[in-house]
């Protein structure tokens, strides 16, 4: 087996004349077994967790993680300083705010310390991996006899987030949803005063500052209006 030489700018000089598909699986050596994929999420740009499925290893292995930023002042290889564990085996690494540089290519390398040739290097765009905290402080105010306005706050730069508002009455079997841009307010033009409304909101780091696919958790729900005589099991399930 030829070895792989790692250079800190993320360009691996690798000769690999031997591949997983080139020999029967019963004769695979440990060094050819694929390493688990690393998945990273940046939580509200406060910390980042990069995790892997440690149980996919044929035997318990404390895999090690190194990282650096390509083409930047931060291109020095860093060792993980705060491992996450699953059943006493490394299964992730947590990076703190000062180690997160959203707009530089993040390079992460997972390695089997007992078999150094067994390594995998991935590149990630952290701005697409941001998950904001759930919206907070939902408030409702009446703009007119039949119009409600929902407001909320986010613990992040407001212009970076888009939002999804869901609402339903206690008569509804499903949510109605509405996309909202960075303005973090939503108006419902016609409210039936005889119904009880429930609203909730979630947010996403998209599209102005990143292209994240993952939404935040839902906010705590907020309610408006009188309790209807019709009991709705959906509503109670929501509040449970």
């Amino acid at each position: 087996l030829n070895t792989t030489i790692l250079t800190p700018n993320g360009n691996e000089d690798a000769t690999t004349d031997f591949f997983l598909t080139s020999m029967p699986t019963d004769s695979l050596s440990v060094s050819t077994l694929p390493l688990p994929e690393v998945q990273c999420f940046v939580f509200n740009v406060e910390y980042m967790n990069c995790t892997w499925n440690s149980s996919s290893e044929p035997q318990p292995t404390n895999l090690t993680l190194h990282y650096w930023y390509k083409n930047s002042d931060n291109d020095k290889v860093q060792k993980c300083s705060h491992y996450l564990f699953s059943e006493e085996i490394t299964s992730g690494c947590q990076l703190q705010k000062k180690e997160i540089h959203l707009y530089q290519t993040f390079v992460v390398q997972l390695q089997d310390p007992r078999e150094p040739r067994r390594q995998a290097t991935q590149m990630l765009k952290l701005q697409n991996l941001v998950i904001p905290w759930a919206p907070e402080n939902l408030t409702l105010r009446k703009l007119s006899e039949s119009q409600l306005e929902l407001n909320w706050n986010n613990r992040f730069l407001n212009h970076c987030l888009e939002h999804l508002v869901q609402y339903r009455t206690d008569w509804d079997h499903s949510w109605t949803e509405q996309s909202v841009d960075y303005r973090h307010k939503f108006s419902l033009p016609s409210v039936d005063g005889q119904k009880r409304y429930t609203f909730r909101v979630r947010s996403r780091f998209n599209p102005l500052c990143g292209s994240a696919q993952h939404w935040s958790e839902w906010s705590h729900p907020i309610h408006w209006g009188s309790n209807s005589s019709k009991e709705n099991p959906f509503l109670f399930a929501l509040e449970a």
Epitope: T4, G10, N11, E12, A14, T16, F19, L20, T21, T32, P34, L35, E37, V38, Q39, C40, V107, Q109, R117, R118, Q119, A120, T121, Q122, M123, L124, K125, N128, L129, Q213
Partner: nanobody, 126 residues
Framework: QVQLVESGGGLVQAGGSLRLSCAAS????????MGWFRQAPGKEREFVAV???????FYTDSVEGRFTFSRDNAKNAVYLEMNDLQPEDTAVYYC????????????????????WGRGTQVTVSS
């Protein structure tokens, strides 16, 4: 049986362009990280570019801004548009596929790829 077949290589003058194609059979590439690697005579195989199945694309420093990676899942193919080619780009170019679970997985390590093509020769004359 999985097959990756590269095409589009050839002889070109410095400053010229080529478009490499990699067509797959026996497997859908839609959930694979796809990589391009190259090997020049007497040198080790090196990473050129990678695209995750979520669409994130990365390049080695020396080709950034000159090469463009694209994919067409309907045709089960990926492409490498190479502009402003230089003599140091002369190499055999290989396409590779890595089955991945996550849309963001983009490997730059060649040993992470399970499937490889036989390569296409690119020669840039000065």
């Amino acid at each position: 049986q999985v097959q990756l077949v590269e095409s589009g290589g050839g002889l070109v003058q410095a400053g010229g362009s080529l478009r490499l194609s990699c067509a797959a059979s026996g497997r859908s590439l839609s959930r694979d990280a796809m990589g391009w690697f190259r090997q020049a005579p007497g040198k080790e195989r090196e990473f050129v570019a990678v695209m995750s199945w979520g669409g994130d694309t990365f390049y080695t420093d020396s080709v950034e801004g000159r090469f463009t990676f694209s994919r067409d899942n309907a045709k089960n193919a990926v492409y490498l548009e190479m502009n402003d080619l230089q003599p140091e780009d002369t190499a055999v170019y290989y396409c590779a596929a890595a089955p991945t679970s996550f849309a963001t997985t983009a490997y730059s390590s060649s040993n992470s790829y399970s499937y490889w093509g036989r390569g296409t020769q690119v020669t840039v004359s000065s």
